[in-house]
C-alpha cells in the first residue's frame, strides 16, 4: 500500500508479486460516506499507472484488467474526480512482476591457503527482478551440514568462514546453492570435492637468489611455501623479454639450482605452488623477484677497423676504431679497452687502456712492421684480442674491386654493390664496406663506419648512422692475406637540388684566362652529393643567354679556369651546384673585366 | 603439535545450563574455524556447533539449535559452548576440533543430564 488508504482501498489479484506475461485484476473501492458530497453517480474513479490514466468509472468502485507489465515495480494509483474540485488520491499499490529463479550454474568452492575460508561463488542466470534469497549449503560427514544465507540483490558468493584442515584430505564435501523467491526456487547442482579439491595454496613468499662463488652457473633460488606444497612451478624471464621459461619441480622444498641464466642481465622471477600432481589448483603467481646475475668474462671478438694517414716523409698516423661487443659477448660492464701496438721485426710493444671510448689514434713511423691487438675487459676477465697488422690498405690495384656503385634503398639505406677484383677473385678472403659523412677538409674526425662481407658476396646494405641528404664517402676494401685492394664512391640515401650555389671569393688573372676561385656550400645545405658545378657568364647589361661550364664535383677542388673571356669586357659571373636532384640557385654574382690584349 | 584440552563438564540436571571450554595450543588458533563434536554413549560421533575464525559466522545442528551458544576468544585461544535447557538425550562426551570431520580433537569432558 501506498499511504493509509482513508478514502478507499486498492486491491490486487492474484497477488501484488506476478509472473511476466500474467494477468491482474485490480480494484479500486470507495470506503462508505467518501465519495463526492450529494451525488454518488458523480464519482468518478480514475486508475492511474504511473502517472498515466488507463481507466476511469462512475460509481463507488472499479475494476481493471492489466495485462503486457513489464519486469520491475509497476506503480498503480487510483484517485476520486468530483466536479469543480482537483483529484483527490484515493489508495495505491505496486506490482512486481519477474521470473522465478534459473538453476544456478558452475557452482564452484575454493579455500585460499591451508588456513583460508572455503567460499563459493556461482552464476545466477538471468535476472529475476524480484527480491530473491540464495541458500549456500555445504555438506560433510557425519551428517555435517553448514547453511548460510545472502540477501545480497545480485549474490553470487558467499564465504562460510570456516576453513577446511589436511587432517582428512579424502573426506568428502558437497556444496549446493538453492535461490527461493516469491515465484518459486531453484538449487544447483552438488559440487562434490575434498580437502586437496579445492585448497589453493597461497603464493610462496620471502624469495631469494644466490649466486655461489658470484658465479652465474652457480645460481639457487630460495622461497617459503605452505607446508603441504607437493609442486611448485618456476617461471624466469630476461627483464627485457616477453618470453618465460617455465620449469616444474617436485618436493623442491623451498629451493631449486638453476643452470641456464645468461650472465650479466637482469632477470624477473616467480613462482606458483600446488599440493597435489593431479588434483587442486595452482596457487597465483608469486611476486616477482627482479636480480642480475653476476658478470663472466667477455666472449666473442672485437670487430677492429683502422685508417692510416701520412704526415710527413717519415711518420704516418693511425687511427684505430672497434664496435662495442654485444651484451651476449660483453657479460658485463666493460671498464676499459687494452689496445697494444707493437713493431713486428723490432719486437717493441706499447700497451694503453683506453676508457669512455671506441677509437685510439697514434702516431707511428712510416718503416717497420706494425700491428695491434685489441680487446675488451670486465670485471671478470677480459675477450680474447682481435689481431691486425697495419698494411696499406689500397696497395695493391690488382684486388681493387670493380664497378663499385651506391644506390639509395629505402630510407636511410644506401645499396653498395661491386664486382669482384681481376685478380683472381678466389684470393679475396673477405671485403669490408666502410663509410663515413663527406667532409670538404677530409676531417679525421668524422665518425668512422664499417662492415665485413663475406667473400662470395658482391653487394652490402648499409643503414647504420646513415641519415638523409647526407653525402658519403664509401670506399670498398677487398682483403686478401697481408694485401689490401679499394675503390671509393659517393653515395646518399635520399637527396634534392643544394640550398645554395657556391660562393666566389676571387677571380684573379693569368695569361688572357681567369682563375675562379669558391667556397665549398656547407654541408648542410649540400642536400646529397654534389655531381657537378656550374660557372655561369655573360656580358654586363647583356639579355643574352650565359655561357656555362660545368666541372665534374671533387672533393678538394675549388678553383677552376676560364680561357674564353674577351678583354676588356666586363662579365657577370656566378656559380651553381648539381645533385642528382637537381640544381641550386645562384651563388653570388661578381663581375670582372679582363684587361689582356685583343687578338 | 597441535593441542586441545577441553574442561567445564559435568552432571546437570534437566533444564540446567553448563559451559564448556577448549583451550588450544600449537597453531595459529585466529586463523581455523573450530568445531564442538560430541558422542553418546554407543553411538557415533555427531557434530554440534562451529564458529569461523573471526568469530562472525556461527553454525548448529538442528538438534541444539537454540539452545546452545558457540564463541571464542581469540586472545586467550579459547574455544566456548554455552549450553542452556539441557535434556537428557544432551548427555555425551564432549569435544573440540580443529578440523570439521573432527580428526585432530581433545580428549574429550562428559557432561551427563539426568534427574
Known amino acids: 500500500k501506498i499511504d493509509a488508504c482513508k478514502r478507499g482501498d486498492v486491491t490486487v489479484k492474484p497477488s501484488h508479486v506476478i509472473l511476466l506475461g500474467s494477468t491482474v485484476n485490480i480494484t479500486c473501492s470507495l470506503k462508505p460516506r467518501q465519495g463526492c458530497f450529494h451525488y454518488s453517480r458523480r464519482n468518478k474513479l480514475i486508475l492511474y499507472k504511473f502517472d498515466r490514466r488507463i481507466n476511469f468509472h462512475h460509481g463507488h468502485s472499479l475494476n481493471s484488467q492489466v495485462t503486457g507489465l513489464p519486469l520491475g515495480t509497476t506503480l498503480f494509483v487510483c484517485k476520486l474526480a468530483c466536479i469543480n474540485s482537483d483529484e483527490i488520491q484515493i489508495c495505491g499499490a505496486e506490482i512486481f512482476v519477474g521470473v522465478a529463479p534459473e538453476q544456478p550454474q558452475n557452482l564452484s568452492c575454493i579455500q585460499k591457503g591451508e588456513q583460508g575460508t572455503v567460499a563459493c561463488t556461482w552464476e545466477r542466470g538471468r535476472d529475476t527482478h524480484l527480491y530473491t534469497e540464495y541458500t549456500l549449503q555445504l555438506s560433510g560427514p557425519k551428517n555435517l551440514t553448514w547453511q548460510k544465507q545472502c540477501k545480497d540483490i545480485y549474490c553470487d558468493y558467499l564465504d562460510f568462514g570456516i576453513n577446511l584442515t589436511p587432517e582428512s584430505p579424502e573426506s568428502n564435501f558437497t556444496a549446493k546453492v538453492t535461490a527461493v523467491n516469491s515465484l518459486g526456487s531453484s538449487s544447483s547442482l552438488p559440487s562434490t570435492f575434498t580437502f586437496l579439491d579445492i585448497v589453493r595454496p597461497l603464493p610462496p613468499w620471502d624469495i631469494r637468489i644466490k649466486f655461489q662463488k658470484a658465479s652465474v652457473s652457480r645460481c639457487t633460488l630460495y622461497w617459503r611455501d605452505e607446508g603441504l606444497v607437493l609442486l611448485n612451478r618456476l617461471r624466469y624471464r630476461p627483464s627485457n623479454s616477453r618470453l618465460w621459461n617455465m620449469v616444474n619441480v617436485t618436493k623442491a622444498k623451498g629451493r631449486h639450482d638453476l643452470l641456464d641464466l645468461k650472465p650479466f642481465t637482469e632477470y624477473e622471477f616467480q613462482i606458483s605452488s600446488k599440493l597435489h600432481l593431479y588434483k587442486g589448483s595452482w596457487s597465483d603467481w608469486s611476486e616477482s623477484l627482479r636480480a642480475q646475475t653476476p658478470e663472466e668474462e667477455p666472449t666473442g671478438m672485437l670487430d677492429v677497423w683502422y685508417m692510416k694517414r701520412h704526415i710527413d716523409y717519415s711518420r704516418q698516423q693511425i687511427s684505430l676504431f672497434w664496435k662495442n661487443l654485444s651484451v651476449s659477448e660483453a657479460r658485463g660492464k666493460i671498464l676499459h679497452y687494452q689496445v697494444t701496438l707493437q713493431e713486428l721485426t723490432g719486437g717493441k710493444a706499447m700497451t694503453q687502456n683506453i676508457t669512455g671510448h671506441t677509437s685510439w689514434t697514434t702516431v707511428i713511423p712510416r718503416t717497420g712492421n706494425w700491428a695491434v691487438a685489441v680487446s675488451a675487459a670486465n670485471s671478470k676477465g677480459s675477450s680474447l684480442p682481435t689481431r691486425i697488422n697495419i698494411m696499406n690498405l689500397c696497395e695493391a690495384g690488382l684486388l681493387a674491386p670493380r664497378q663499385v656503385s651506391a644506390n639509395s634503398e629505402g630510407m636511410d639505406n644506401i645499396l653498395v654493390t661491386w664486382q669482384p677484383p681481376r685478380k683472381d677473385p678466389s684470393a679475396v678472403q673477405e671485403y669490408v664496406v666502410e663509410w663515413r659523412e663527406l667532409h670538404p677538409g677530409g676531417d679525421t674526425q668524422v665518425p668512422l663506419n664499417w662492415l665485413r662481407s663475406r667473400p662470395y658476396n658482391v653487394s652490402a646494405l648499409i643503414s647504420e648512422n646513415i641519415k638523409s641528404y647526407i653525402c658519403y664517402e664509401i670506399r670498398v676494401y677487398a682483403l686478401s692475406g697481408d694485401q689490401g685492394g679499394c675503390s671509393s664512391i659517393l653515395g646518399n640515401s635520399k637527396h634534392k637540388a643544394p640550398l645554395s650555389g657556391p660562393h666566389i671569393n676571387a677571380i684573379t688573372e693569368e695569361k688572357g684566362s681567369i682563375l675562379i676561385s669558391w667556397n665549398s656550400i656547407p654541408v648542410q645545405e649540400q642536400m646529397g652529393c654534389l655531381l657537378h658545378y656550374r660557372i655561369y657568364w655573360k656580358e654586363r647589361d647583356s639579355n643574352s643567354q650565359p655561357q656555362l661550364c660545368e666541372i665534374p664535383y671533387r672533393v678538394s677542388q675549388n678553383s677552376h679556369p676560364i680561357n674564353s673571356l674577351q678583354p676588356r669586357v666586363t662579365y657577370v659571373l656566378w656559380m651553381t651546384a648539381l645533385t642528382a636532384a637537381g640544381e641550386s640557385s645562384h651563388g653570388n654574382e661578381r663581375e670582372f673585366c679582363l684587361q689582356g690584349k685583343a687578338n | 603439535q597441535v593441542q586441545l584440552q577441553e574442561s567445564g563438564g559435568g552432571s546437570v540436571q534437566p533444564g540446567g545450563s553448563l559451559r564448556l571450554s577448549c583451550g588450544a595450543s600449537?597453531?595459529?588458533?585466529?586463523?581455523?574455524?573450530m568445531h564442538w563434536f560430541r558422542q553418546a554413549p554407543g553411538k557415533g560421533q555427531e557434530w554440534a556447533a562451529t564458529i569461523s575464525s573471526s568469530g562472525g559466522t556461527t553454525y548448529y545442528s538442528d538438534s541444539v539449535k537454540g539452545r546452545f551458544t558457540i564463541s571464542r576468544d581469540n586472545a586467550k585461544n579459547t574455544l566456548y559452548l554455552q549450553m542452556n535447557s539441557l535434556k537428557p538425550e544432551d548427555t555425551a562426551l564432549y569435544y573440540c576440533a580443529r578440523d570439521v570431520t573432527g580428526a585432530v580433537r581433545g580428549q574429550g569432558t562428559q557432561v551427563t543430564v539426568s534427574s
Open positions: 600449537g597453531f595459529t588458533f585466529s586463523s581455523f574455524g
